[in-house]
Amino acid sequence: IWELKKDVYVVELDWYPDAPGEMVVLTCDTPEEDGITWTLDQSSEVLGSGKTLTIQVKEFGDAGQYTCHKGGEVLSHSLLLLHKKEDGIWSTDILKDQKEPKNKTFLRCEAKNYSGRFTCWWLTTISTDLTFSVKSSRGSSDPQGVTCGAATLSAERVRGDNKEYEYSVECQEDSACPAAEESLPIEVMVDAVHKLKYENYTSSFFIRDIIKPDPPKNLQLKPLKNSRQVEVSWEYPDTWSTPHSYFSLTFCVQVQGKSKREKKDRVFTDKTSATVICRKNASISVRAQDRYYSSSWSEWASVPCS
Amino acid sequence: RAVPGGSSPAWTQCQQLSQKLCTLAWSAHPLVGHMDLREEGDEETTNDVPHIQCGDGCDPQGLRDNSQFCLQRIHQGLIFYEKLLGSDIFTGEPSLLPDSPVGQLHASLLGLSQLLQPEGHHWETQQIPSLSPSQPWQRLLLRFKILRSLQAFVAVAARVFAHGAATLSP
């Protein structure tokens, strides 16, 4: 058993049929010695008396808020949560496996630049009695600070019969060094509590591996005289690291017909303009990627040819 | 060419070669994210690798103030990786495919390090750790780790030379 926060404790349970329960001794936080009684949750029934209460925690029915009282007055609370371990593996019932980029990916994170700011998100089908708490650091043995905000519900989607909820959190490395080569990964730890179930999820990454620039901005077409060619121009996204002479992007320009089956013409360039042939009803799209490190491409920025 | 003591390197040549290094490093090991090498424990490999750190002056401001600190650090790293790519980690079993980009990568590392330090001039180089994996699978894993680490290193080096070429060239 360990303390998650003040008056909240996590009991780690081996979850198999013939596992013995965990013996837990609760102590009432009071100088009083006599006349102390214990109750659980909303029930007013006395579960035991004395400054300590010894319980066996085996089921979610044994978890909950234990309260000690004296003469009708509440003295202290202890909320017990359960963390299940099945076949030696901690349960992952609360979050959905996003399966990208690999199985057992519960947390996904992205950064728009090298500033040390990143966003992580996760999915769940649970809509109520759910809380998250996020901590992060650079490295784990001698951790350097990363500050994370509160996790918030960022999207709701209907997936078949189920509703899916997306939560996200923004974090910022306290002393980021955008130009340095990272040697220690960022660690992100999410504590998830659903009713009386506790779970924790972790992700470890280098900022360089989660970079995904915003799409190029100000995408414009300039027709070339007496030609079906156009000059496409764009700019670096505002959110990208500066100076651009140092933090350079490379771009992919694509001409795509109306039909998805039509052949796509693609051009790669380090410049912020390109000359392409604009077909009728086609659209021109541009996306960006770090020039020197193959992390994710940005989403496409698009304009119609006409 | 970078001459120890203060003169500037051939920024544009260094830029072109370092960008080529980036391309080669990624073609040698393109599996981004498919194998999480950090799960395999990096202690013996990457702890000894020379990283370009915050105080090495490789940021735009540091380069403007005095690019020599950064260039020396890059040179150290290039020599380190060049030795690693020439070691039995890459020459031993399992053999690399004949058209593997590792050979070109090795040559380009040497080429860029020579651009930075002509014959007869010596910067302090870092001792290469004695890594001699016994099993072919260990060697394979080590190659992946080294190439992943090299990708990060050459990306920073390429940024330095691109910025130098754009802002510090005579």
Epitope: P17, D18, A19, P20, G21, M23, L40, D41, Q42, S43, S44, E45, L47, G48, L53, T54, I55, Q56, V57, K58, E59, F60, G61, D62, G64, Y66 | -
Partner: antibody
Framework: EVQLVQSGAEVKKPGESLKISCQSS????????IGWVRQMPGQGLEWIGI????????RYNPMFRGQVTMSVDKSSSTAYLQWSSLKASDTAMYYC????????????WGQGTMVTVSS | EIVLTQSPATLSASPGERATISCRAS??????LAWYQQKPGQAPRSLIY???NRQSGIPARFSGSGSGTDFTLTISSLEPEDFAVYYC?????????FGQGTRLEIK
Amino acid sequence: EVQLVQSGAEVKKPGESLKISCQSSGYSFTTYWIGWVRQMPGQGLEWIGIMSPVDSDIRYNPMFRGQVTMSVDKSSSTAYLQWSSLKASDTAMYYCARRRPGQGYFDFWGQGTMVTVSS
Amino acid sequence: EIVLTQSPATLSASPGERATISCRASQSVSSWLAWYQQKPGQAPRSLIYAASNRQSGIPARFSGSGSGTDFTLTISSLEPEDFAVYYCQQYNIYPYTFGQGTRLEIK
């Protein structure tokens, strides 16, 4: 006052189905799991299983799994034990009981339902 | 599953005497053992839990002791209403199991 009131005695034929009930009152129904115990004529007590009234989480004795089904209706604070096809060997007194949280034993018992299966 | 063996199977005693019933487990159940009393035609009633804690409303003449595999229920001075069948139950490991019972009869 805590009370578990069980449905009346049943006489059934082999192969018939049956559902007996146990209505709880006088306490917070969702805080306490409900269990069932069998006592065959002239025999001792046998633990059938327990169930959570919150989410219907169930722990069956392997000996009874597939033979009986436990269920619960939160809205009426009632637990059920049912058979889809009774056998003569199901003849027994069935008790519902309240599981004490933080322990696991049964602190309050229903009066019992006698089930007789005979052709 | 854990087997609980009670002894004796039948105990004959007189009111005012001390009665001791033993319960032995086939493997350790820590202190997670309860005792119940059952009178003819009635449901069992909880007496002792966690090996030695008296259920509220149970007279002080009933006491429990033991841990691990050996447990004892003691009635210090028998009253006429104490003559009944007594069961021990372990609730450490599923499936929870009961002893076969001890009949306490008037000598």
